[in-house]
Amino acid sequence: EVEKTACPSGKKAREIDESLIFYKKWELEACVDAALLATQMDRVNAIPFTYEQLDVLKHKLDELYPQGYPESVIQHLGYLFLKMSPEDIRKWNVTSLETLKALLEVNKGHEMSPQVATLIDRFVKGRGQLDKDTLDTLTAFYPGYLCSLSPEELSSVPPSSIWAVRPQDLDTCDPRQLDVLYPKARLAFQNMNGSEYFVKIQSFLGGAPTEDLKALSQQNVSMDLATFMKLRTDAVLPLTVAEVQKLLGPHVEGLKAEERHRPVRDWILRQRQDDLDTLGLGLQGGIPNGYLVLDLSMQEALS
């Protein structure tokens, strides 16, 4: 806390400019009017104030706006945003996407801080849902943003917003998140033709059920192994050897390299060995010829 002292004669700030970087902390406190600072916030970002000097400027704004800063000030905080605590940000009402962009720009190139996470949370809650423009903005700054949300939060993403999602935005999503996103993507891309549809839906397929994978296998999509390895194990297990062969197309040869890894390993255990042999890849571990396969889950359902 800076001591309250009178401003030395001739030092009262008439505008926010570079000359203020020569002021000591107590002089900034005494000689800069908080209302002037608030109206000229856009200038602060261009002035190389030290970390300690910015503390004083923040303190002045806190005194002027104890209930939280107005958006006109928030939009122009610039580097002063880095001084804000999550508690400060929870007092704000940020409604403009331009304000959000301006503050994300300040933190650009750095990991998402608690301040940024709180800001985004406040903004999204204020809007009621993650609309396309917001999602566009957030994933541009933080490609992993979508995967940082819980399945519950993802449920508020409208299908129209899915168009903003790039494959790299889903890199760190887990199956529970893809389970929520996949149906939205399917809805969003439903009017596209076969090959275009597959290009768009591919990154979401970690949430696809068996019946959709069966349908894709009829469309000559040539799924790559990296995508196949991200599919839900429970969705892959019921696929026949012929369906997997059609699904992967020329990439089917890659199964050999992945035979010890899920979901390939578990899928092999469910196939007849003679069916696997038709692939000519030397895959081992299938059900030996002559063995009877009982689907106990079906039996339980019937009894």
Epitope: E18, A46, I47, F49
Partner: nanobody, 116 residues
Framework: QVQLVESGGGLVQPGGSLRLSCAAS????????VAWYRQAPGKEREAVAV???????KYADSVKGRFTISRYNAKNIAYLQMNSLKPEDTAVYYC??????????WGQGTQVTVSS
């Protein structure tokens, strides 16, 4: 992460001159104000000169008429020409931009000692 490297310091007699240089690893100087600061032992860091992106210059009262700040955007270098040096100018000198100063990220500085 942007790296700032200050150089040109040394031991000089009162009344002597030194020219400090500040080189940046990225193109952060263009479009940004650049300032020189100094920190004497036991004292807080203080700004001594600033040059805006438009080339306007401002100086602390204690160095006016003796120090000159300049910049060469094409090479990402800023300079501080120091003339008529006094013992009280003894300090570690740093350069920085608004972003670096705001996040308290500094170069290693360059030591200036004015002594007979």
């Amino acid at each position: 992460q942007v790296q700032l490297v200050e150089s040109g310091g040394g031991l000089v007699q009162p009344g002597g001159s030194l020219r400090l240089s500040c080189a940046a690893s990225g193109s952060i100087f263009s479009g940004n104000a650049v300032a020189w600061y100094r920190q004497a032992p036991g004292k807080e860091r203080e700004a001594v000169a600033v040059i805006t992106r438009d080339g306007d210059t401002k100086y602390a009262d204690s160095v006016k008429g003796r120090f000159t700040i300049s910049r060469y955007n094409a090479k990402n270098i800023a300079y501080l020409q120091m003339n008529s040096l006094k013992p009280e100018d003894t300090a570690v000198y740093y350069c920085n931009t608004a972003r670096g100063a705001a996040v308290d990220s500094w170069g290693q500085g360059t030591q200036v000692t004015v002594s007979s």
